[in-house]
């Protein structure tokens, strides 16, 4: 399987909400002993590998924001902790999974990474991630709503093992 990032750049005004999205592509094993662990974290554009550094999103770690379930099942974080920080991660039946960030501030600007780990026979054999940039703007140059910029077809399919 692969992870696609439909949009590589999100430009949003301060105070707006945004939903960052990744999509699980390709054949997904729905075996009884296969689980998909999906999560989000902030990172920086490393010289060697993007998304290799895992930093919290609004003080919440990837452990706080994770989802785990089989195949293309729906799930979402019901953590009070996440919602108190204006965050919610979710996953649908079609392989899309997302993180919603409410009431954006300039401090939310940066690189965001989604991570999917396939757990088979109680350990991971396959890990992939996707990356996208969030720019939060203020002032007269800021858009009135979030503007999203599609990934090039090459970027959205180009996945590096996490």
């Amino acid at each position: 399987f692969k992870v696609a990032t439909p949009y590589s750049l999100y430009v949003c005004p301060e105070g707006q909400n945004v939903t960052l999205t990744c999509r699980l592509l390709g054949p997904v094993d729905k075996g009884h002993d296969v689980t998909f662990y999906k999560t989000w974290y902030r990172s920086s554009r490393g010289e060697v590998q993007t998304c290799s550094e895992r930093r919290p999103i609004r003080n919440l770690t990837f452990q706080d924001l994770h989802l785990h379930h089989g195949g293309h099942q729906a799930a979402n974080t019901s953590h009070d902790l996440a919602q108190r920080h204006g965050l919610e991660s979710a996953s649908d039946h079609h392989g899309n999974f997302s993180i919603t960030m409410r009431n954006l501030t300039l401090l939310d600007s940066g690189l965001y990474c989604c991570l999917v780990v396939e757990i088979r026979h109680h350990h991971s054999e396959h890990r992939v991630h996707g990356a996208m940039e969030l720019q939060v703007q203020t002032g007269k140059d800021a858009p009135s709503n979030c503007v999203v910029y599609p990934s090039s077809s090459q970027d959205s399919e180009n996945i590096t093992a996490a």
């Epitope: 662990y37 452990q63 785990h68 026979h121 109680h122 350990h123 991971s124 996490a162």
Partner: antibody, heavy 119, light 106 residues
Amino acid sequence: EVQLLESGGGLVQPGGSLRLSCAASGFTFSNYYMHWVRQAPGKGLEWVSSISFTGSTSYNPSLKSRFTISRDNSKNTLYLQMNSLRAEDTAVYYCARLGIPFFTYLDYWGQGTLVTVSS
Amino acid sequence: QSVLTQPPSASGTPGQRVTISCGGNNIGSKSVHWYQQLPGTAPKLLIYEDTERPSGVSDRFSGSKSGTSASLAISGLRSEDEADYYCQAWDSSTVVFGGGTKLTVL
């Protein structure tokens, strides 16, 4: 601070049973796969069993029919039920947490509980 | 019989660099992890995913992997490094450990 505290070890006769417990604290227990690993006196580490978030289990093939792993997420506790014990089961039993998001290594271990099988 | 093979013992003098190997079938395609077990204590994660160090582990410890063998290197050897060292990987659906290497600081 992550803490794993095993209990329930002791002296048991061959053929007997014992139930080990591992109390977890300092992390969200239900988010983690958990494992049991044992170490016979003066010997190396031997993997015993693992259990997933949801209760799916995996065992060392040589032990599967006699040992049963389980968990109670509401009590943050991991268990190992050991039946038909033999002298060769004498060991220190450790519970350990599988590290995330890689799910391949054991990042925290308890201090262990000694099980002695002897008549 | 361990699927991962380690030398039973290794030794070095303070300040020296010591390397412990871990061999096994298809080890090049597996993630290898290393644990340190000080006398009378539980194992502690030392290196994960071949080369990564958990926070709090000294940078004197490093991991590498090439071909059919993984290695743990300890530089600037100290007396407190005297311990048993185990490599670990997965074989199908089971966790496997090497037989362990007893490191003596002379």
